[in-house]
């Protein structure tokens, strides 16, 4: 990659491992924990970041926890399987060999199981709603401001192309932000609403996974927008699969 | 290999409307984003609006909206760049260029069409 | 809008020389920056994307470079089938996607 080819680090991952061993001395870059090569131009996978942060020593993580008000991701952070193109494979399993089936953002949908546990097909998640709660401010954001500046943010930082941006909403102090992608819109080199959804995540927390790159910083028209809370909702191509038990 | 093949040379009166179309073979249609870009005579290049097959979405350069409408079919892996309300600086070349999601690069483009018009 | 500015606007080099063609952002675009070549009459070509990266089949003698908002297109050794136009395009911002000017590069 080009960024910051002198000192050979990735712009987008700060959880890599770069060396100028790639073709013509090209600085190449490998994600911590699964040692696959990533593309430094686009956000890298939610699978292999989470792999990266499972596989940070537990005294060097610059990590924090999630915060109380965050829905944390199927049950918390676990270290995941990730196929040869860092996607989440459908069936997870931890080191007890209890197993239980994702969806493409790493959330599971179903029971935990045993090994003899079958998850046929990842299931894509195809909408994803982030639903923020801003501090309060002198007065309300006006919302195309909001809009624009939200979809400039996405595709900017996160390279999303605002057509995946469906809807903006406002109802002071909530922002909910829709994220639409059916596998058949995706067109090379555009960037999955699940990658985009996790690296938004990370840095409302202040958890940002860029390298070099400074914290967020959202401003509507010169005003600051701080999030105070944030909740993720995913909706699945096919609903998930859970027994009536766990819904009660 | 890759080939976008546009359509002919058109000479249009003012106020006409012209319809290019570009066929595009040798990659799968409706995986990467259509562009279309023109070049007025001895001018830059002007970026003028993208399309997704896939889906038919599509967005336009503000100085077109109104005037341009991009359309596709998928059963010919046809992309079309239809221009209203011509005028005499809208005599250019107009090309359809692949482009890349992400570093929205243009890889192949079209051989151009002319589009000349005179009253 | 994002503008792009390219110079020189026009170069006359020769066979052999290393050229240097710059591209000025108006606003940050990390890396998101591509560069064409352009011969009379026919369509552009993809040279460079993304700074640095070559484009499939184009000769390692064109090189790239810069972050922010200077951006270098670099010929080491100029063959006579370089002589062309170059653009710059920035494909970083929400649409439209702007070029650069051109630079027209002539035999000296």
């Known amino acids: 990659h080009t960024a910051a080819q002198d000192n050979c680090t990735c712009p987008t991952n700060k959880m890599t491992v770069c060396s100028p061993d790639g073709p013509g001395g090209r600085c190449q870059c490998r994600a911590l924990g699964s040692g696959m090569a990533v593309d430094c131009s686009t956000l890298t996978s939610k699978c292999l970041l989470l792999k990266a942060r499972m596989s940070a020593p537990k005294n060097a993580r610059t990590l924090v926890r999630p915060s109380e008000h965050a829905l944390v991701d199927n049950d918390g952070l676990y270290d995941p399987d990730c196929d040869p193109e860092g996607r989440f494979k459908a069936r997870q399993c931890n080191q007890t060999s209890v197993c239980w089936c994702v969806n493409s953002v790493g959330v599971r949908r179903t029971d935990k199981g045993d090994l003899s546990l079958r998850c046929d097909e990842l299931v894509r998640t195809h909408h994803i709603l982030i639903d923020l709660r801003h501090r309060p401010t002198a007065g309300a954001f006006n919302h195309s401001d909001l809009d624009a500046e939200l979809r400039r943010l996405f595709r900017e930082r996160y390279r999303l192309h605002p057509k995946f941006v469906a809807a903006v909403h406002y109802e002071q102090p909530t922002i909910q932000i829709e994220l639409r992608q059916n596998t058949s819109q995706k067109a090379a080199g555009d960037v999955d609403i699940g990658d985009a959804a996790y690296y938004f995540e990370r840095d409302i927390k202040g958890e940002s996974l860029f390298q070099g790159r400074g914290g967020l910083d959202l401003r509507v028209r010169g005003e600051p927008l701080q999030v105070e809370r944030t909740l993720i909702y995913y909706l699945d191509e096919i609903p998930p699969k859970f027994s009536m038990k766990r819904l009660t | 290999q890759v080939q976008l093949v546009q359509s002919g040379a058109e000479v249009k009166k003012p106020g006409a409307s012209v319809k290019v179309s570009c066929k595009a073979s040798?990659?799968?249609?409706?995986?990467?984003?259509m562009h279309w870009v023109r070049q007025a005579p001895g001018q830059g290049l002007e970026w003028m609006g993208e399309i997704t097959p896939s889906d038919n979405y599509t967005s336009y350069a503000q100085k077109f909206k109104g005037r341009v409408t991009i359309t596709r079919d998928t059963s010919t892996s046809t992309a079309y760049m239809e221009l209203s309300s011509l005028r005499s600086e809208d005599t250019a070349v107009y090309y359809c260029a692949r482009g890349h999601g992400n570093y929205v690069s243009f890889d192949y483009w079209g051989q151009g069409t002319l589009v000349t018009v005179s009253s | 809008d994002i503008q792009m500015t390219q110079s020189p606007s026009s170069l006359s080099a020769s066979v052999g020389d290393r050229v240097t063609i710059t591209c000025r952002a108006s606003q940050d675009i990390s890396n998101y920056l591509n560069w064409y070549q352009q011969k009379p009459g026919k369509a552009p070509k993809l040279l460079i994307y993304?700074?640095?990266r070559l484009h499939s089949g184009v000769p390692s003698r064109f090189s790239g470079s810069g972050s922010g908002t200077d951006f270098t297109l670099t010929i080491s050794s100029l063959q006579p089938e370089d002589f062309a136009t170059y653009f710059c395009q920035q494909g970083y911002s929400l649409p439209p996607y702007t070029f650069g000017q051109g630079t027209k590069l002539e035999i000296k």
């Open positions: 040798g990659y799968t249609f409706t995986s990467y984003w």
């Open positions: 993304y700074t640095s």
